[in-house]
Interface confidence: low
């Protein structure tokens, strides 16, 4: 997170830290006791699927305070439409091997109903993004969980206000832009997969997933987030289906 | 529409202002009271805009210069109280007033619903947690807010 602040301990209780072979991989969002939402691109280069760990209740990576809960990732489900190395359909659903125990420091973020997300949450201007990613483009990653308030843009406005870059990916209907184009604040590498959380009338909801950008906090560019509202039925159907063998599963979308 | 005027000094009113055209000052002499004179003058000088009973659905009318104001019963709104508030109570308008989820129904009022782990309150719009750790709430902030001293 560039230009953010420390999320006070316990105030981002749905934040997940994903580790592979003990090393920081990505962020994620707890949506109930056994399911985590993250970004598909986080898993492009994974070889040791059995060494994936999700940590809940984490705050400061340099110390263990007893509120952390670690769970093995039993399954990673990615939409069949996602192509590794690209940006569209950048979403993954992770099933934990065992459920986490909800506490003051471990709480799920609400996965909203699609219509509510599209016609109400999408028009809430500011939302929070969080993670332990880089504090500057090409800089060091954070030890304490960072958080940033970002404004959402209509895709048309995002395209008009962004500098044209020759090989820049399209902003599809499965994404949205949020943040600032003045180079001051953005999510960054290492925050990928983490939550874009929107507050409405006292409750927080998952509206986006940290996905991609032209560098981090680059002048003339916004952060791009996976538009979760497009995947709500897909996520719900998967969460209600019986588990399948194998860690990586490509599930038909839509 | 302005029956109260008939009670006021009827003899002088007939003589000065109904049989002949009177001025504001002459009317002031009759009513002896600025507020009552003003009410009379609005109606007298440009006609009673409430005469056509423009306020619908039981609304009451107040005449103004070249216009009128409707005071609507609680369930109605609009210039002429023509709009039933429930007709505006649809999900695209401010989420139908619902705290969480909203469903439109043809022929009946929209209904509000709550996320799993919450229940709808008797007001039909608010949601209350039914589990210790409902999604989307931050326990340490909820507890901090709950322990703040309340204003009296």
């Amino acid at each position: 997170i560039v230009g953010g602040k420390v999320c006070p301990k316990g105030e981002c209780p749905w934040q997940v830290l994903l580790l592979v072979n003990g090393a920081q991989l990505c962020g994620g969002t707890l949506i109930n006791t056994i399911w985590v939402v993250s970004a598909a691109h986080c898993f492009d280069k994974i070889k040791n699927w059995r060494n994936l760990i999700a940590v809940l209740g984490e705050h400061d990576l340099s110390e263990h305070d007893g509120d952390e809960q670690s769970r093995r990732v039993a399954q990673v489900i990615i939409p069949s439409t996602y192509v590794p190395g690209t940006t569209n359909h950048d979403i993954a659903l992770l099933r934990l091997h065992q459920p986490v125990v909800l506490t003051d420091h471990v709480v799920p973020l609400c996965l909203p109903e699609r219509t509510f997300s599209e016609r109400t949450l999408a028009f809430v201007r500011f939302s929070l993004v969080s993670g332990w990613g880089q504090l500057l483009d090409r800089g060091a990653t954070a030890l304490e969980l960072m958080v940033l308030n970002v404004p959402r843009l209509m895709t048309q406005d995002c395209l008009q206000q962004s500098r044209k870059v020759g090989d820049s990916p399209n902003i599809t209907e499965y994404m949205f832009c949020a943040g600032y184009s003045d180079g001051s604040k953005d999510s960054c590498k290492g925050d990928s997969g983490g939550p874009h959380a929107t507050h409405y009338r006292g409750t927080w909801y998952l509206t986006g997933i940290v996905s991609w950008g032209q560098g981090c906090a680059t002048v003339g560019h916004f952060g791009v987030y996976t538009r979760v509202s497009q995947y709500i039925e897909w996520l719900q159907k998967l969460m209600r289906s019986e588990p399948r063998p194998g860690v990586l599963l490509r599930a038909p979308f839509p | 529409a302005n029956a109260f005027l008939e009670e006021l000094r009827p003899g002088s009113l007939e003589r000065e202002c109904k049989e002949e055209q009177c001025s504001f000052e002459e009317a002031r002499e009759i009513f002896k009271d600025a507020e009552r004179t003003k009410l009379f003058w609005i109606s007298y000088s440009d006609g009673d805009q409430c005469a056509s009973s423009p306020c619908q659905n039981g609304g009451s009318c107040k005449d103004q210069l070249q216009s009128y104001i409707c005071f609507c019963l609680p369930a109605f709104e609009g210039r002429n109280c023509e709009t039933h508030k429930d007709d505006q109570l649809i999900c695209v308008n401010e989420n139908g007033g619902c705290e969480q989820y909203c469903s439109d129904h043809t022929g009946t009022k929209r209904s509000c619903r709550c996320h799993e782990g919450y229940s709808l309150l008797a007001d039909g719009v608010s949601c209350t947690p039914t589990v210790e750790y409902p999604c989307g709430k931050i326990p340490i902030l909820e507890k901090r807010n709950a322990s703040k001293p309340q204003g009296r």
């Epitope: 109930n32 934990l96 091997h97 459920p99 125990v101 | 989820y101 799993e116 782990g117």
Partner: antibody
Framework: QVQLQESGPGLVKPSQTLSLTCTVS?????????WSWIRQPPGKGLEWIGY???????NYNPSLKSRVTISVDTSKNQFSLKLSSVTAADTAVYYC???????????????WGQGTSVTVSS | EIVLTQSPATLSLSPGERATLSCRAS??????LHWYQQKPGEAPRLLIK???QPATGIPARFSGSGSGTDFTLTISSLEPEDFAVYYC?????????FGQGTKLEIK
């Protein structure tokens, strides 16, 4: 094949504590399910009492909460129900059950014990 | 708590006929509603989960529909073994609640 078997006394005196145990076979109780108790008074419908996760977190029906304790013993692959201060109204068939809880708290009860009848009488 | 009202209380039909059982919720459940069948002296059996998804091993003649507050369990052509009591269950909010049941009896 998952199997659940309730056990405990069939007769309990009023004001005493009803204690039942559910032994699970064919599945590790320390896996990802919720383990519930549900009861059915004679000739009546079903009433959910509460559940416990393998981890020990519980959720009880508010109407019974002050009298109910559900606990788990992972070493024996068992979970238990204690209902204190019983009256004749607690006479029922008591079922233990497993909810395959893939989606948060939407408990579709896929596996049931055969039920044990408990009478509260002096 | 969410109250589930099942209707009719008793339904008398003959084998081969179509049965339609209703469950109405006092507030919206989305599709968090499950159906069970119970025969005398037996534990209930899960038939339909999430309003319309058949549980494992349930014959195709059983189907569920609805969302929000109104739900229906349909048995397309009754078999003799289908005569039993059917319950709907709220899986949306705690406390989990059941309907009072519909008894399906042979005419």
């Amino acid at each position: 094949q998952v199997q659940l078997q309730e056990s405990g006394p069939g007769l309990v005196k009023p004001s005493q504590t009803l204690s039942l145990t559910c032994t699970v076979s064919g599945y590790s109780i320390s896996s990802d399910s919720a383990w519930s108790w549900i009861r059915q008074p004679p000739g009546k419908g079903l009433e959910w009492i509460g559940y416990i996760y393998y981890s020990g977190s519980t959720n009880y029906n508010p109407s019974l909460k002050s009298r109910v304790t559900i606990s788990v013993d992972t070493s024996k692959n068992q979970f238990s129900l204690k209902l204190s201060s019983v009256t004749a109204a607690d006479t029922a068939v008591y079922y233990c059950a497993r909810s395959v809880n893939y989606y948060g708290n939407s408990f579709a009860v896929g596996y049931w014990g055969q039920g044990t009848s408990v009478t509260v009488s002096s | 708590e969410i109250v589930l009202t099942q209707s009719p209380a008793t339904l008398s039909l003959s084998p081969g006929e179509r049965a339609t059982l209703s469950c109405r919720a006092s507030q919206g459940l989305s599709d968090y509603l499950h159906w069970y069948q119970q025969k005398p002296g037996e534990a209930p059996r899960l038939l339909i989960k999430y309003a319309s998804q058949p549980a494992t091993g349930i014959p195709a003649r059983f189907s569920g529909s609805g969302s929000g507050t109104d739900f229906t369990l349909t048995i397309s052509s009754l078999e003799p073994e289908d005569f039993a009591v059917y319950y709907c269950q709220n899986g949306h909010s705690f406390p989990l609640t059941f309907g009072q049941g519909t008894k399906l009896e042979i005419k």
